[in-house]
Amino acid sequence: EEELQVIQPDKSISVAAGESATLHCTVTSLIPVGPIQWFRGAGPGRELIYNQKEGHFPRVTTVSDLTKRNNMDFSIRISNITPADAGTYYCVKFRKGSPDDVEFKSGAGTELSVRAKPSAPVVSGPAARATPQHTVSFTCESHGFSPRDITLKWFKNGNELSDFQTNVDPAGDSVSYSIHSTAKVVLTREDVHSQVICEVAHVTLQGDPLRGTANLSETIRVPPTLEVTQQPVRAENQVNVTCQVRKFYPQRLQLTWLENGNVSRTETASTLTENKDGTYNWMSWLLVNVSAHRDDVKLTCQVEHDGQPAVSKSHDLKVSAHPKEQGSNTAPGPALASAAPL
């Protein structure tokens, strides 16, 4: 009779994580007497996967009925495959012996590669907000995928970005891999509604890439523009001065009025109006009793936005005598004049 051969017909197989892997093995003879064992890897450090002779292998089942003497099929099925199961599996025939069974012949091996989906990409932006015209970095991370080949793209509002660097780790063979990418984005004043998207494509995703997003609203700070204007006289000796706070983001804003450098009133922004671009406007007004002032009045609108150093805009009210208005019973009072805002 010809000497026994161990045949592993599949040089390699690829299995999706969570599925079962069937490793095929047949022998060509019933002799010598002795068990079949399956190992992962070769050499002294090889890992026993299944032993026909003894042991408990809860994830392994035999494809054929090994209690049938004329069975020559020693294929096994490993359930619930994970990336850690990747490797080369050898079907090995042993000859009954003592003190240990003697390895008689090994199959050529079957390489099992595990297709594992990448985790959902997580995009994170800078810890602190930045203002338009500044460049900020975003990172994207995804883990646990196999095989190593993967494609990562960055988009800002649907437009692909080109300024990014990507690393896949580890560089050598591994059961699974991670990807890390950093993209640079230049902020504009219109970016409150903008999104940065990291898109990951992998063989396991069957053409349906995974996306992670970051809203630039978490990253951007648009500082306000201020305009102080004097409104027409409301009453004989009262002037209404308004401070227009425009195009700011985020909402957190505190405004202080100063009359000749002295705090007149402080208020926190509320009932804001939102612009189409996602920024906000707010208006504060101050009624100034001119008769209470002998000299010119310097009114300052001081705004502290999102914890940043205050910005301010001033307006000079000139106090001067003016004739009594016709039809008015009020006594002559100072005339009002406004200087251009500072």
């Epitope: 009779e1 002799i31 002795g34 002779k53 004329n70 009954k96 012996g97």
Partner: antibody
Framework: EVQLVESGGGLVQPGGSLRLSCAAS????????MHWVRQAPGKGLEWVSA???????YYTGSVKGRFTISRENAKNSLYLQMNSLRAADTAVYYC????????????WGQGTMVTVSS | DIQMTQSPSSLSASVGDRVTITCRAS??????AAWFQQKPGKAPKSLIY???SLHSGVPSKFSGSGSGTDFTLTISSLQPEDFATYYC?????????FGQGTKLEIK
């Protein structure tokens, strides 16, 4: 049902011959290593002979050259040809099937008695 | 040839007892040790192979252990039908050899 039935035992004079048969049913005999085991009256078990699936044969020292094990696949039967019989060969002879992969004995026949006496 | 030495040669026990029979091989036999039960006038019955694996249909009160040279057969709770003679065997290499037997009797 898997079964082994021995026959051919009996009384024989020293120096005589006897041929034991073992008819197998429920399995293909040629796919298994097959054995003969004997038990002298009031004594323990003694392995006598075996035939492998490739036709390879094995004997215990005391019967070498006198006993021959064989099989006939067409009849699904095992045989033990015993020549030059001695009084010490007096025993119940059992036909035994070796296990699937390690040759552990799993199925025993009911035995046939061989008496060697003048 | 590999010698198999069983002890004790005979053993008296009561129903419900737990009993252990030991077998020592004259040289290492890996775990190719088997155990058989034989009742008077009957053919032996296979109980255990590869030291600890139970043959199909054998009740779990029988258990085997050991590797190398020392092996044990344990019956966890004796029943009347368990009183018989028990044999160990090595089947790692020819000639296969048996122990001399242990006769288990009712006390």
């Amino acid at each position: 049902e898997v079964q082994l039935v021995e026959s051919g035992g009996g009384l024989v004079q020293p120096g005589g011959s006897l041929r034991l048969s073992c008819a197998a049913s429920g399995f293909t005999l040629s796919s298994y290593d097959m054995h003969w085991v004997r038990q002298a009256p009031g004594k323990g078990l003694e392995w006598v002979s075996a035939i492998g699936t490739a036709g390879d044969t094995y004997y215990t020292g005391s019967v070498k050259g006198r006993f021959t094990i064989s099989r006939e696949n067409a009849k699904n039967s095992l045989y033990l040809q015993m020549n030059s019989l001695r009084a010490a060969d007096t025993a119940v002879y059992y036909c035994v099937r070796g296990g699937v992969w390690d040759d552990a004995f799993d199925i025993w026949g009911q035995g046939t008695m061989v008496t060697v006496s003048s | 040839d590999i010698q198999m030495t069983q002890s004790p040669s005979s053993l008296s026990a009561s129903v419900g007892d737990r009993v252990t029979i030991t077998c020592r091989a004259s040289q290492g036999i890996n775990n190719y040790a088997a155990w058989f039960q034989q009742k008077p006038g009957k053919a032996p019955k296979s109980l255990i192979y590869t030291a600890s694996s139970l043959h199909s249909g054998v009740p779990s009160k029988f258990s085997g252990s050991g590797s190398g040279t020392d092996f044990t057969l344990t019956i966890s709770s004796l029943q009347p039908e368990d009183f018989a003679t028990y044999y160990c065997q090595q089947y790692v290499s020819y000639p296969y050899t048996f122990g001399q037997g242990t006769k288990l009797e009712i006390k």
